[in-house]
């Protein structure tokens, strides 16, 4: 049994770090493997994560880490019974992937303006709460070329656009993701998409 693709880990900067890796063949991750993790330098208990399968040869482990500072670094040991398959380290503050925003809603009743709102995925007492910026993706279900990204660089989880910037009479979908510049994070996953029918009053043409 060998590791084909070494574990890579990301932290949600809240309570969970997720590590993924691939084995060299089909593996029952939960029965055959264990991922041990422990803080470097600080005296603390070693913790064990039981991985789950993620495709035939893929494994994923959700490491519980609920008290983390910038200086913290973890050793990671991947074991198959008594055999050490891989040893590495992981610094949560340097590998942050924010949680995905939720509750994306499109308000279409605001005088030819579309108001998109969503929820910040972090509670107000989390450091990332006031540091997230967003990207909103809007696309047409009918026309694959009608695909646009709006960067929301202010803190408020909302976006206003004129309905007239989109085509009238057709259906659109939107989704949103987040990142935090302060930790040079990766982008979060996209939120679930929401659908609406875009319609607005065309202005009268002047002749």
């Amino acid at each position: 049994m060998k590791v084909l693709q070494e574990p890579t880990c990301v932290s949600d900067y809240m309570s969970i770090s997720t590590c993924e890796w691939k084995m060299n063949g089909p593996t029952n991750c939960s029965t055959e493997l264990r991922l041990l993790y422990q803080l470097v330098f600080l005296l603390s208990e070693a913790h064990t994560c039981i991985p789950e399968n993620n495709g035939g040869a893929g494994c994923v482990c959700h490491l519980l880490m609920d008290d983390v500072v910038s200086a913290d670094n973890y050793t990671l040991d991947l074991w198959a019974g008594q055999q050490l398959l891989w040893k590495g380290s992981f610094k949560p503050s340097e590998h942050v992937k924010p949680r995905a925003p939720g509750n994306l809603t499109v308000h279409t009743n605001v005088s030819d303006t579309l108001l998109l709102t969503w929820s910040n995925p972090y509670p107000p007492d989390n450091y990332l709460y006031n540091h997230l910026t967003y990207a909103v993706n809007i696309w047409s279900e009918n026309d694959p070329a009608d695909f646009r990204i709006y960067n929301v660089t202010y803190l408020e989880p909302s976006l206003r656009i004129a309905a007239s910037t989109l085509k009238s009479g057709i259906s659109y979908r939107a989704r949103v993701r987040a990142w935090a510049q302060c930790y040079n994070t990766t982008w979060s996953e996209w939120s679930p998409s929401t659908k609406w029918h875009n319609s607005y009053r065309e202005p009268f043409e002047q002749h």
């Epitope: 932290s11 330098f41 910038s70």
Partner: antibody, heavy 124, light 107 residues
């Protein structure tokens, strides 16, 4: 108002022990990590030890590892430093410091509140 | 461990002038740097964290900049109460380490 008051310092002979205490008030003590930082006469600041809110993780500078033990009593809002096998180079003003941020994920550790310090002199 | 080096050791400045203090890390600490002010007989006071974020109640004349290995604390117009020793501290790695300090004295 956040207050940190250290006590327990004094003159002690090399090889002997001393226990420092820090009484905390003005904040929810059991939400925060706490630390000890010292300053030798005429020198700069040196981090000595730190302890997480639940005592689940503890750290020591190499210079005191194996000799000093940090602990806390959240019910009493108190932080302690048990210093054994003291040496002349442990002579310093010892500060109790509250970690900035809160329990959970946070930047740090840096220290947003400090006590006035308690002086430890190790001499024969 | 990460070694923090501050310069100059002493800075002589007249009240109202600008003071620029430097702090260098032996390896990158990203933005994980704090600055403290320390006066004799008093508790140290947090000025800056995250390399550039002013702590609560700190006047706007104090500003921090830099990332990686080079950091600067600037006091735009020195007031009489600003004469003190200033320390930088990295919190990118355990053990936490401080610079040797810069004493800002009256010229």
């Amino acid at each position: 108002e956040v207050q940190l008051v250290e006590s327990g310092g004094g003159l002690v002979q090399p090889g002997r022990s001393l226990r420092l205490s820090c009484a905390a008030s003005g904040f929810t003590f059991d939400n925060y990590a706490m630390h000890w930082v010292r300053q030798a006469p005429g020198k700069g600041l040196e981090w000595v030890s730190g302890i997480r809110w639940n005592s689940g993780s503890i750290g020591y500078a190499d210079s005191v590892k194996g000799r000093f033990t940090i602990s806390r009593d959240n019910a009493k809002n108190s932080l302690y430093l048990q210093m054994n096998s003291l040496r002349a180079e442990d002579t310093a003003l010892y500060y109790c410091a509250k970690e900035g941020g809160y329990s959970g994920y946070r930047p740090g550790p840096f220290f947003d509140y400090w006590g006035q310090g308690t002086l430890v002199t190790v001499s024969s | 461990e990460i070694v923090m080096t501050q310069s100059p050791a002493t800075l002589s400045v007249s009240p109202g002038e600008r003071a620029t203090l430097s702090c260098r890390a032996s390896q990158s600490v990203n933005y994980n740097l704090a600055w403290y002010q320390h006066k004799p007989g008093q508790a140290p006071r947090l000025l800056i964290y995250g390399a550039s974020t002013r702590a609560t109640g700190i006047p706007a004349r104090f500003s921090g900049s830099g990332s990686g290995t080079e950091f600067t604390l600037t006091i735009s117009s020195l007031q009489s109460e600003d004469f003190a020793v200033y320390y930088c501290q990295q919190y990118n790695n355990w053990p936490l380490t401080f610079g040797g300090g810069t004493k800002v004295e009256i010229k």
